[in-house]
């Protein structure tokens, strides 16, 4: 039975050229995390595997840094980075948990962080 919840940074905005941390946190479960996938719509950005460590897509390696923790740091943001991001937690024995983050990259300096929220 899956009892955990994924808490994410929610809907966030950031300035063009800046950086942002995409963060998910799995709580309310003692399940062991075996792998975390970070995906952007149809692309795999990065994987953190408990045994094999971090692997970043070559398409993003100049702008994506692993961490902090199981999160992902996006740098040198462009307007094209706007969109949905997913953290997919593979766990034992629970199974798979998915969190969603929407990032909006703004041209102006009006970027504000959205509130944190939970996805059951």
């Amino acid at each position: 039975m899956m009892t955990g919840t994924i808490e994410t940074t929610g809907n966030i905005s950031a300035e063009k050229g800046g950086s942002i941390i995409l963060q998910c946190h799995l709580s309310s479960t003692t399940a062991q995390v075996t792998q975390v996938n970070w995906e952007q719509q149809d692309q795999l950005l990065a994987i953190c595997n408990a045994d094999l460590g971090w692997h970043i897509s070559p398409s993003f390696k100049d702008r994506v840094a692993p961490g902090p923790g199981l999160g992902l740091t996006l740098q040198s943001l462009t307007v094209n980075d706007t969109g949905e991001y997913f953290c997919i937690y593979h766990t034992y024995p629970d199974g798979t948990y998915t969190g969603r983050i929407f990032l909006e990259v703004l041209e102006s300096s009006v970027a504000e962080h959205g509130a944190r929220f939970q996805i059951p």
């Epitope: 075996t34 792998q35 996938n37 995906e39 408990a50 045994d51 692997h55 997919i88 593979h90 034992y92």
Partner: nanobody, 117 residues
Framework: EVQLVESGGGLVQAGGSLRLSCAAS????????SMWWFRQAPGKEREFLA????????LYADSVKGRFTISADNAKNTVYLQMNSLKPEDTAVYYC??????????WGQGTQVTVSS
């Protein structure tokens, strides 16, 4: 317990192609979290090549991007590595590894690929 068996290696001339297979047995294949290909050349460290996730998303190492393609056939419980435009420096033992949603990895025994110039 899962077992992975690689096949398809061999001797090929530079510029040629090979398709490696990694067949899984002993567990429902479609429940994997990710399948990986690595290689190890004599006297060198193991090198990551490619990943395919359970959602069929892929990620490649710089050294093989555009030349190698990873794919999976869940019905056949098999992951493939299509290798094109092979170079002598691709000579190595190629390994697949599987990560399921339980602790630990499963490794295959490896298959030798030799690219002659």
């Amino acid at each position: 317990e899962v077992q992975l068996v690689e096949s398809g290696g061999g001797l090929v001339q530079a510029g040629g192609s090979l398709r490696l297979s990694c067949a899984a047995s002993g567990r429902t294949f479609s429940t994997y979290a990710s399948m990986w290909w690595f290689r190890q050349a004599p006297g060198k460290e193991r090198e990551f090549l490619a990943i395919i996730t359970d959602g069929s998303k892929t990620l490649y190492a710089d050294s093989v991007k555009g030349r190698f393609t990873i794919s999976a056939d869940n019905a056949k419980n098999t992951v493939y590595l299509q290798m094109n435009s092979l170079k002598p420096e691709d000579t190595a033992v190629y390994y697949c590894a599987g990560s399921w949603s339980y602790p630990g990895l499963t490794w295959g025994q490896g298959t030798q690929v030799t690219v002659s110039s």
